[in-house]
């Protein structure tokens, strides 16, 4: 492993459709991929009227958007389905939402970011 990189070997697995899909609802997923590729964890969830509904969690494949992210954070503003990815074993156990504010004209009343959601 390269120094400073948190290598992902396993992730929290969760499937909201577990009863219908007849899988385990939750567990630990071992992550595989090409030897020269990086591996990550991910989480997807929905915000239904302020209530967080996890969709799926598990291993994610080599993705530059996940590089060197130790925390699983969604930064898009109000996506249809929230998604975050990270590096490091089980790093998707907790996830949060910090939308990046678009900087336009500075105002006298700065906008406070929305609070994060944590699993």
């Amino acid at each position: 492993a390269i120094l400073g990189r948190s290598e992902t070997q396993e992730c929290l697995f969760f499937n909201a459709n577990w009863e219908k899909d007849r899988t385990n609802q939750t567990g630990v997923e071992p992550c595989y991929g090409d030897k020269d590729k990086r591996r990550h964890c991910f989480a997807t969830w929905k915000n239904i009227s302020g209530s967080i509904e996890i969709v799926k969690q598990g291993c994610w494949l080599d993705d530059i958007n996940c590089y060197d992210r130790t925390d699983c954070v969604e930064k898009k503003d109000s996506p249809e389905v929230y998604f975050c990815c990270c590096e490091g074993n089980m790093c998707n156990e907790k996830f949060s939402y910090f939308p990046e504010m678009e900087v336009t004209q500075p105002t006298s009343n700065p906008v406070t970011p929305k609070p994060p959601y944590y699993n």
Partner: antibody, heavy 120, light 107 residues
């Protein structure tokens, strides 16, 4: 890199059963997510069901429920798909396929396919 | 069951063209959508997963987009080896269902 090698072609009578095997080589077989997909001649693709050997429980498409049994033998790194009460419309190529992840991102490694012909 | 439809069912194009294939789902599989290429007598090959992620080893002229219920596969600068049948597949919930396919032929 995982490789999937399937058993050879089969010719079966209507009403009988067929059992197709799929031997995996590569990383830990029990951690793979394996699906079975079939394709009738000149037709599209149809997902039949899947299994993660470490969990043991198979998941079947409603269409095949009661007629298909998917199992996995960890000792030989082999997955099996058995289809019973065969009819002519079951004539198809049957593929064993590995998924990228347990959350079913995509079917990335396919066996060579097994042609099953159902004919009286 | 999520029903997948594709359009067109077939199209003709020339080497160097850009083509777009559309896939629609009866219910939103979110982004759990994959695209496959299949040539006669061969097993399908995964091209795109999670609607827009290029599978390892697939040329960058293939791209995917969309979310919700509407997805597209675009092939830019068509090469002779790209003439094949293309399928979309949802893997949000079982049974995982495929589109009926789009046959891409040489004009």
């Amino acid at each position: 890199q995982v490789q999937l090698v399937q058993s050879g072609a089969e010719v079966k009578k209507p009403g009988s059963s067929v059992k197709v095997s799929c031997k995996a080589s590569g990383p830990r077989f029990q951690d793979l997510s394996i699906s079975w997909v079939r394709q009738a001649p000149g037709q599209g693709l149809e997902w039949m069901g899947g299994i993660i050997p470490i969990y043991g429980t198979a998941n079947y498409a409603q269409k095949f429920q009661g007629r298909v049994t998917i199992t996995a033998d960890e000792s030989t790194s082999t997955a099996y798909m058995e289809l019973s009460s065969l009819r002519s419309e079951d004539t198809a190529v049957y593929y064993c396929v590995k998924d990228l992840t347990w959350t079913n991102l995509g079917l990335d490694i396919w066996g060579q396919g097994t042609m099953v012909t159902v004919s009286s | 069951e999520i029903v997948m439809t594709q359009s067109p069912s077939s199209l003709s194009a020339s080497v160097g063209d850009t083509v777009t294939i559309t896939c629609r789902a009866s219910q939103g599989p979110s982004r759990w959508l994959a695209w496959y290429q299949q040539k006669p007598g061969k097993a399908p090959r995964l091209l795109i997963y999670w609607a827009a992620h290029l599978q390892s080893g697939v040329p960058s002229r293939f791209s995917g987009s969309g979310s919700g219920t509407h997805f597209t596969l675009t092939i830019s600068s068509l090469q002779p080896e790209d003439f094949a049948t293309y399928f979309c597949q949802q893997s949000y919930s079982t049974p995982f269902t495929f589109g009926p396919g789009t046959k891409l032929e040489i004009k």
